[in-house]
């Protein structure tokens, strides 16, 4: 008898089964149909809760969740100060917008990353066209 | 409407024999295996056998070898004969489909694995 | 012959909640595992096959993951619609050239 499987019907390194009466496809993950021809989509139906946004990867999806939420569809409230947001000692504030970050003396930016200097100048990164350093970043 | 209705069941005495039948409608019976799958009062669903319509294949559970027969009928129906019948027996029998796929230029028919039709189910109780 | 468990066998849970139900099958099965629901009185209904592709009109808060071995099916925003027994399967291919299919013993679930 030919041996069906030796043409390699299976996609995606499925493997082949001849059944005898059919052949049978066991896919790898992340791929299905009757030859593993589908590549799944892993974020298809897959909502994430509150603003967070599916990731694909590895045949499961995971969800990036908003600031403040967590667990695997983002319907968990989390802390957002839990991380430690803020650089050099500043202060985390929980904030329903997010968090706020009141920075240590000597200290400045949005999460307290930039050094003050102490002629009054900050040491931002240059800002893009249209944007002062000192103005809140976006 | 797709649909699979089974009949012939009801109460039967040890020792006896029974044919149940299933009778499809609503979708073309070839590139599917139908199959009849048991289930005991509060217990899960058992395989016993499948027969696949192209070319009239059958194939059942090793433990459903030499009572449980199933045959092709006609070109919208199977049935499932049972032979030496036990109380072991009683359960509500199940007709399913299992769909198979065929492609333009491929070697054979692939299965699916899975049941994505199912009938309500015909009760047998084996009782004297 | 491949061996399908379920676990747990029962499980409770509130409207709004999530349930995760496990089936470990006894090879390796690849992504070849489907997820049916039943109601009493009811044959059981095909939720999603190849571990994750849900049936058409099954709504999204069904969610099967899993590969190989060890698979899921997760059910969240419970509703007292999902209170049914649910039963993985899958097929197997032995050596000795027969081929067949095998159910989890299921689990049940109760929406309170």
């Known amino acids: 008898r030919v041996d069906r499987c030796s043409l390699q019907p299976c996609r995606n390194g499925g493997l082949c089964l001849d059944l005898g009466h059919a052949l049978r496809c066991r896919c790898r993950a992340g791929f299905a149909g009757p030859r593993c021809e589908h590549d799944l989509d892993d974020c298809a139906g897959r909502a994430c809760a509150n603003g967070g946004t599916c990731v694909e990867g590895g045949g499961a999806h995971r969800c990036s969740c908003a600031l403040g939420f967590g667990g695997r569809d983002c319907r968990e409230r989390a802390d957002p100060c839990a991380a430690r947001p803020c650089a050099h000692g500043g202060r985390c504030y929980a904030h329903f917008s997010g968090l706020v970050c009141a920075c240590a003396p000597g200290y400045m930016g949005a999460r307290c990353e930039f050094p003050v200097h102490p002629d009054g100048a900050s040491a931002l990164p240059a800002a893009p066209p249209g944007l002062r350093p000192g103005d809140p970043q976006r | 409407q797709e649909q699979l209705v089974e009949s012939g069941g009801g109460l039967v005495q040890p020792g006896a024999s029974l044919t149940l039948t299933c009778k499809a409608s609503?979708?073309?019976?070839?590139?599917?295996?139908m199959c009849w799958v048991r289930q005991a009062p509060g217990k899960g669903p058992e395989w016993i056998a499948c027969i696949y319509n192209d070319d009239g294949s059958a194939y059942s559970a090793s433990w459903a070898k030499g009572r449980f027969t199933v045959s092709k009928t006609s070109s919208t129906a199977v049935t499932l004969q049972v032979t030496g019948l036990t109380a072991a027996d009683t359960a509500t029998y199940f007709c399913a489909r299992s769909p198979y796929y065929t492609y333009g230029g491929a070697p054979s028919a692939y299965a699916s694995g899975y049941f994505n039709l199912w009938g309500p189910g015909t009760l047998v109780t084996v009782s004297s | 012959d491949i061996v399908m468990t379920q676990t747990p066998a029962s499980v409770e849970a509130a409207v709004g909640g999530t349930v995760t139900i496990k089936c470990q099958a006894s090879?390796?099965?690849?992504?070849?595992l489907a997820w049916y629901q039943q109601k009493p009185g009811q044959p059981p209904k095909l939720l999603m096959h190849?571990?994750?592709v849900l049936t058409s009109g099954v709504p999204s808060r069904f969610s099967g993951s899993g590969y190989g071995t060890e698979f899921t099916l997760t059910i969240s925003d419970l509703e007292c619609a999902d209170a049914a027994t649910y039963y993985c399967?899958?097929?197997?291919?032995?050596?000795?050239?027969?081929?067949?299919?095998?159910f989890g013993g299921g689990t049940e679930v109760v929406v309170k």
């Open positions: 399967q899958s097929d197997y291919y032995s050596t000795g050239g027969s081929y067949g299919f095998a």
């Open positions: 090879e390796n099965i690849y992504n070849s």
């Open positions: 609503g979708f073309d019976f070839t590139s599917n295996a």
């Open positions: 190849d571990a994750s």
